[in-house]
């Protein structure tokens, strides 16, 4: 059986947010996958596809796993969007410098959509967010997903404030 060529993980950094878009590991490739997550300082991983591996080993390494699957090629539900943006806001506020990993099967559709939403909510224009991710992950997004992102109206939920209550547009290291 021909093995699918797995694209390398892609790190996307914007302001104080850091994401890792990655592929779907199998139980056989799990150890290498965990090594990669640790290398990037991942503390949370969001699985947006159906489970194909046991998360126990990942969680034993202190990485929090969330299962928020949605259909391939489709946009995420409003509930997933709300949960995702809340998670992003809290994680980067409470764990400065951390990294959130997101993966679907190949890391070309569902995962980049969630990352793009975070970038848009952080103040990036839709076109810039798409280009920014595509520069790193060629072939990301299908036409349905692009239309969804184009129509998405940000609520500016990720405009982080500094400790003095001012809008913070720079990276927190």
């Amino acid at each position: 059986m021909a093995r699918m060529n797995r694209p390398a993980p892609v790190e996307v950094t914007y302001k104080n947010m850091r994401f890792l878009i990655t592929h779907n590991p199998t139980n056989a490739t799990l150890n290498k996958f965990i090594e990669e997550l640790k290398k990037y300082g991942v503390t949370t991983i969001v699985r947006v596809c159906e489970a194909t591996y046991d998360t126990t080993l990942v969680e034993k390494e202190g990485i929090h796993v969330l299962d928020w699957p949605f259909d391939d090629g489709a946009p995420p539900s409003n509930q997933i969007v709300d949960d995702w943006l809340s998670l992003v806001k809290i994680k980067f506020r409470e764990e400065p410098g951390c990294c959130i990993a997101v993966h679907c099967v190949a890391g070309l559709g569902r995962a980049p959509v969630l990352v793009a939403l975070a970038l848009i909510e952080g103040g990036m224009k839709y076109e810039d967010a798409v280009q920014f991710i595509r520069q790193k992950r060629r072939g990301a997004f299908n036409s349905k997903q692009l239309l969804y992102l184009e129509k998405y109206r940000p609520k500016m939920r990720l405009r982080f404030k500094d400790s003095n209550g001012h809008r913070n547009n720079c990276c927190i290291q």
């Epitope: 998360t55 126990t56 969680e59 929090h64 299962d67 809340s86 998670l87 809290i90 994680k91």
Partner: antibody
């Protein structure tokens, strides 16, 4: 707003088991770990363990591995902690806490173990 | 003005909370990530770090501040609490 409603005070006999609950509201229950913390009268706080409601994964403080069992029911957004083989040392207030890193806390459940 | 200090025995970065426990047992987080104030917490509370020492400072004490305070590290498992400080009126 985020809230945790813990079950009422428990009086139990040595050797028995109890199961207390923590009902979460105001956020999506599966998004964050649910931690449990013990406080003996006049003492400090001690971490017991957590459950990831999304996957069911649990992690325990070595000290409570054979004492506590954590479970969660996604449909009712409720976390549970069962304490077994009770002794007077288990008499304490037990707190649940979640939302990010211990962002909010339940009001506590008082457990009294007495014959 | 009063400062409470917690010393970390290993590197926890900025992963430290300060908690307040009232006499009725109610626990509330005041500070997260070493120095960020939780919403609704009065500005007289502040958090800081110097090396492995983490401090909670109350700039101007109010009567309701004379309760118990705990630090909590959430950098890695097992999560650990400081022994706690009871703030009392002289």
């Amino acid at each position: 707003q985020v809230q945790f409603q813990q079950s009422g005070a428990e009086l139990a006999k040595p050797g028995a088991s109890v199961k207390m609950s923590c009902k979460a509201s105001g956020y999506t229950f599966t998004s964050y770990r649910m931690h449990w913390v013990k406080q003996r009268p006049g003492q400090g706080l001690e971490w017991i363990g957590y459950i990831n409601p999304s996957t069911g994964y649990t992690e325990y403080n070595q000290k409570f591995k054979d004492k506590a069992t954590l479970t969660a029911d996604k449909s009712s957004s409720t976390a549970y902690m069962q304490l077994s083989s009770l002794t007077s040392e288990d008499s304490a207030v037990y707190y649940c806490s979640s939302y990010g890193n211990f962002g909010y806390w339940g009001q506590g459940t008082t457990l009294t173990v007495s014959s | 003005r009063v400062s409470l200090t917690c010393r970390a025995s290993q590197d926890i970065g900025s992963s430290l909370n300060w908690l307040q426990q009232k006499a009725d047992g109610t626990i509330k987080r005041l500070i997260y990530a070493t120095s960020s104030l939780d919403s609704g917490v009065p500005k007289r509370f502040s958090g800081s770090r110097s090396g492995s020492d983490y401090s909670l400072t109350i700039s101007s004490l109010e009567s309701e501040d004379f309760v118990d305070y705990y630090c909590l590290q959430y950098a890695s498992s097992p999560w650990t609490f400081g022994g706690g400080t009871k703030l009392e009126i002289k």
